[in-house]
Amino acid sequence: GPETLCGAELVDALQFVCGDRGFYFNKPTGYGSSSRRAPQTGIVDECCFRSCDLRRLEMYCAPLKPAKSA
């Protein structure tokens, strides 16, 4: 059957996949869509109710923070 992730298991998966980057429950504003009226897609919609793979999870990781310079 479809591989879904919900609740605490979804949070665990996001924390693991995103490592030290952190993650969003909703894609950042403007992510993957030029329409301001497009409804914001959330990870729960995408992974709890539909098949969810690692690439889908990675889309909700925060960007890598640039290394601090001296």
Epitope: P2, E3, D12, C18, G19, D53, L54
Partner: antibody, heavy 123, light 107 residues
Framework: QLQLQESGPGLVKPSETLSLTCTVS??????????WGWIRQPPGKGLEWIGG???????YYNPSLKSRVTMSVDTSKNQFSLKLSSVTAADTAVYYC???????????????WGRGTLVTVSS | DIQMTQSPSSVSASVGDSVTITCRAS??????LAWYQQKPGKAPKLLIY???SLQSGVPSRFSGNGSGTDFTLTISSLQPEDFATYYC?????????FGPGTKVDIK
Amino acid sequence: QLQLQESGPGLVKPSETLSLTCTVSGGSIRSSSYYWGWIRQPPGKGLEWIGGIYYSGSTYYNPSLKSRVTMSVDTSKNQFSLKLSSVTAADTAVYYCARQRGHSSGWWYFDLWGRGTLVTVSS
Amino acid sequence: DIQMTQSPSSVSASVGDSVTITCRASQGISSYLAWYQQKPGKAPKLLIYAASSLQSGVPSRFSGNGSGTDFTLTISSLQPEDFATYYCQQANNFPFTFGPGTKVDIK
């Protein structure tokens, strides 16, 4: 070059907790590019992924074992550990620790393995 | 979980032969598949990742192909050191799962 070495008791009694440690040498466990995992192989059988850990301590476990598994990392010792509780004879296996490419590569494969350690569950 | 199946479960071949092993996933996994070689008493060794990319240091006689649900590992000219068991692994979904293995032995 980087190497992994498992250590821990080779014999565990039923209902007790199996404890293993993997020592990383020749490199740092604190790499944003890599994850660290445990895989086991019962004698004469195939491979089963137990779970993985990131250097920050975040974990993800195979749901089939989740209720019995705990993983931890000690960056000061360059080690990560596995605990498997309430073991039975079915947990008898060779346990491998492995390095896994993570999100920065987008692949999630095990590119470096320890030699493995046989753990027998018997009274 | 995604179930991985391999065929054949074992194959007998001679040095110089070409051998092809098939791996099938119970649902589509794009190209997120790896192949490992394991010799008796040793740890698995990564051969191929991303279905067709050769891991550094692995001889070019090993090649991988496929996407979606069907994948193959081909050893173009079998060498004595290639007699081993080969496993596929999907890296598309949690939990990561392996095929049951294909043993390549001497005819």
